[in-house]
Interface confidence: medium
């Protein structure tokens, strides 16, 4: 233990100017003071000061007040330091002397005269209050005040626990008043040395090095590390744990980076046209009349529509197009007509009826004819009526569709699901597709239709066709073709056209 | 809250004696931690200390003013007291009270709102 | 009889420090108490034994007393703050304020 007893007078009087032998001091007494501090005794005895003792310079004459906190070369407060464990008694003696010698050192000098004396005795806690007293006899009296405070770095009611503050590597502390350690903003601990991370820092995936850090573990990234990294050159893939890349709707491959709804995503087919999705970065186009080119950019001749009616013939010009009428028609189109039904108008077996007071007329045409004289066979595919790319052809008086594979139905709008005879073994998953099946095949099971066993290095027979390159490890016994563009297939084997299920699992 | 008022009148003569009494409240006059003291200020200009006493009747005097001034302390009514004689115009000033800490360099932490007295004839 | 020198006047842009000493021979030795006064009201207790803040004081005021000088340092000085201050020691048994200094906040 460590710490100090304090001792400030404060004022003295000695209005007479009287020695403790009854004798006057000439020409006054000449004031200064010994104070012996040492264990508590019921009784005060002569001995060593054992908790210490000191002396004051001249204080003042006769009667005075001790305002300056040094004094020539006292102190005020007396400090009586000790380096032992408060007991919280103690036993005070405070004598006043009068000198005629020397002001700084009475001590010193000879012929030194007692004024008076006290004695204290008794309890005192260590702490910051001052505890103020004074005492009379019957020529003097004596104002001071008294406490007990521990040296730096001690701590506690005996002044007994050591505690240094710090703020390094070792702890980032205060000292309570107990000499407990209140750790510093930021930092935990029993010895405040593990930082406080910043605030929602992931436990797992997160750590830091001081506070109000977050520095993420390998595989995580963001401001409080709890975003996974995806696997280096993930393009259009996200991921749940480190170095995964499940891939976005509409993308494949290994990284997916394969477009498999390039229609969406670059908008290839213009003027309208309609985008069909045909395999990773494969497309085609189905134009609108008018339009044709491979992204129906081109725009047809204006007469290609056929826009003169009543057998005029078409001339294209440089916005637009002009109708040259046969006698008898006028009108942008050729669509007015000067002939009546006298003038037997109506082709193919069509009836006339006149209108407008035999001014015009109208044809009513057989079956299988159209136009306003009935000079047009009726062509039943210009209605577009197959659907899912169904081809449409006229057959006599009526039009078929010829569905392409998974599709059925007068108009193609049936889907036929290949995945109904269950045709991938050993528990392969099966994907409709345009074109027919595709399996994804279970660890240690390879092939079209997953019927080939894997007993050896996935890798190693070379199963990656046109320059595609293999990968194993990434589930026991699997490999994955990762295709070189223009190629599609768990191996690679297909050019654009057959559209896959991404990625390819052999 | 300890709260100090200064009481008297606002107007002296010259030649007579200024009498000016202080009443404390909300603490005793009587604790040995406090010496009680008075401080004046002319118009425009800085503070000036006059003396104090302890609550036991000792007193302590500005040198400059010593002939001239008595501080008392009555410890029943709580209250003490200033008397400056034959005072001039050089002594017009707002006169305050305060309480002295005992300890040292304690300051004075409570005055009172101040009284101006004014010497004249 | 013992004197307590300051400088009649310190001015100072809000939020800058303001620096005012107090001269006195080894003041250092004694204990420094400085006081302020706004216009028309009682001082107030701003430092204590040369360096201690009383209750209800802010952390912008403080003070340092060796050799011979006293200082009271005003950092990030306010508006409010404008007003006289006086610094005062014991010189034995006799009270010694200092004549005062203006502080003027720009």
């Known amino acids: 233990g460590s710490g100090i007893f304090q001792l400030r007078l404060q004022e003295f009087v000695n209005q007479r100017g009287m020695l403790a032998n009854g004798q006057s001091c000439e020409p006054g007494c000449r004031t200064f003071f010994r104070i012996c501090l040492k264990h508590f005794q019921a009784t005060f005895s002569e001995g060593p000061c054992t908790f210490g003792n000191v002396s004051t310079p001249v204080l003042g004459t006769n009667s005075f007040v001790v305002r300056d906190k040094n004094s020539g070369s006292g102190r005020n407060p007396l400090q009586l330091p000790f380096n032992f464990t408060w007991p919280g008694t103690f036993s005070l003696n405070i004598q006043a002397w009068h000198t005629p010698g020397d002001d700084l050192r009475p001590e010193t000098s000879p012929g030194n005269s007692l004024i008076s004396q006290i004695i204290i005795q008794g309890s005192l806690a260590v702490g910051k209050i001052w505890r103020t007293d004074e005492q009379n006899d019957t020529l003097t009296r004596l104002s001071y005040s008294y406490r007990v405070i521990c040296s730096d770095n001690y701590y506690g009611e005996s002044c007994s626990r050591l505690c240094k503050k710090r703020d390094d590597h070792f702890g980032h502390y205060e000292c309570q008043p107990d000499g407990s350690l209140s750790c510093l903003p930021g930092w935990t601990g029993k010895y405040c040395d593990q930082p406080i991370c910043l605030s929602g820092c992931h436990e797992q995936n997160g750590y830091c090095s001081k506070p109000d850090e977050c520095i993420c573990r390998p595989g995580w990234q963001g401001r409080l590390c709890n975003e996974c990294i995806p696997h280096n050159g993930c393009r259009h893939g996200t991921c749940s744990i480190p170095w995964q890349c499940a891939c976005d709707e509409g993308w494949g491959g290994l990284f997916c980076d394969q477009d498999l709804n390039y229609c969406t995503h670059h908008s290839p087919c213009k003027n309208g046209s309609t985008c069909s999705n045909s395999g990773p970065k494969g497309y085609t186009c189905t134009c609108l009349p008018g339009y044709t080119g491979e992204h129906c950019e081109l725009g047809l001749s204006k007469c290609a529509s056929n826009p003169c009616r009543n057998g005029g013939s078409c001339k294209d010009q440089e916005n637009s197009y002009h109708c040259l009428c046969p006698p008898g028609y006028y009108g942008q189109h050729c669509e007015h007509s000067t002939l009546t039904c006298a003038d037997s108008p109506c082709f193919n077996g069509g009836s006339c009826r006149e209108r407008n007071q035999g001014s015009s007329y109208a044809c009513e045409c057989p079956p299988n004819f159209t136009g306003s004289n009935c000079e047009k066979k009726v062509d039943r595919c210009t209605s577009n009526p197959c659907a899912n790319g169904g081809q449409c052809q006229n057959r006599g008086p009526s039009r078929t569709c010829r569905c392409r594979p998974g599709f059925t139905g007068t108009h193609c709008e049936l889907h036929i699901s290949d995945c109904a005879r269950s045709p991938c073994a050993h528990g392969g998953t099966c994907h409709d597709l345009e074109n027919g099946p595709v399996c994804t095949c279970p660890a240690g099971f390879s092939g079209r239709r997953c019927e080939v066993r894997i007993t050896h290095d996935a890798c190693a027979s070379g199963p990656c066709f046109n320059g595609a390159t293999c990968y194993t490890g990434l589930s026991p016994n699997n490999f994955v073709c990762n295709c070189p563009y223009g190629f599609v297939g768990s191996r690679c084997e297909f050019p654009v056209g057959l559209p896959p299920s991404f990625p390819w699992v052999a | 809250e300890v709260q100090l008022q200064e009481s008297g009148p606002g107007l002296v003569k010259p030649s007579e004696t200024l009498s000016l009494t202080c009443t404390v409240s909300g603490g005793s006059i009587s604790s040995s931690s406090y010496y009680w003291g008075w401080i004046r200020q002319p118009p425009g200009k800085g503070l000036e200390w006059i003396g104090d006493?302890?609550?036991?009747?000792?007193?302590y005097y500005n040198p400059s003013l010593k002939s001239r001034v008595t501080i008392s302390v009555d410890t029943s009514k709580n209250q003490f007291s200033l008397k400056l004689s034959s005072v001039t115009a050089a002594d017009t000033a707002v006169y305050y009270c305060?309480?002295?800490?005992?300890?040292?360099?304690?300051?004075?932490?409570?005055w009172g709102q101040g009284t101006l007295v004014t010497v004249s004839s | 009889s013992y004197e307590l020198t300051q400088p009649p006047s310190v001015s100072v842009s809000p939020g800058q420090t303001a620096s005012i000493t107090c001269s006195g021979q080894?003041?250092?030795?004694?204990?420094a108490s400085w006081y302020q006064q706004k216009p028309g009201q009682s001082p107030v207790l701003v430092i204590y034994e040369d360096s201690k803040r009383p209750s209800g004081i802010p952390e912008r005021f403080s003070g340092s007393n060796s050799g011979d000088t006293a200082t009271l340092t005003i950092s990030g000085t306010q508006p409010m703050d404008e007003a006289d201050y006086y610094c005062?020691?014991?010189?034995?048994?006799?009270?010694?304020f200092g004549y005062g200094t203006k502080v003027t906040v720009l």
């Open positions: 305060a309480r002295e800490e005992a300890i040292l360099g304690g300051g004075s932490d409570y």
């Open positions: 080894r003041l250092g030795d004694k204990y």
């Open positions: 005062q020691a014991w010189d034995r048994d006799t009270g010694v």
């Open positions: 006493i302890y609550y036991t009747g000792s007193t």
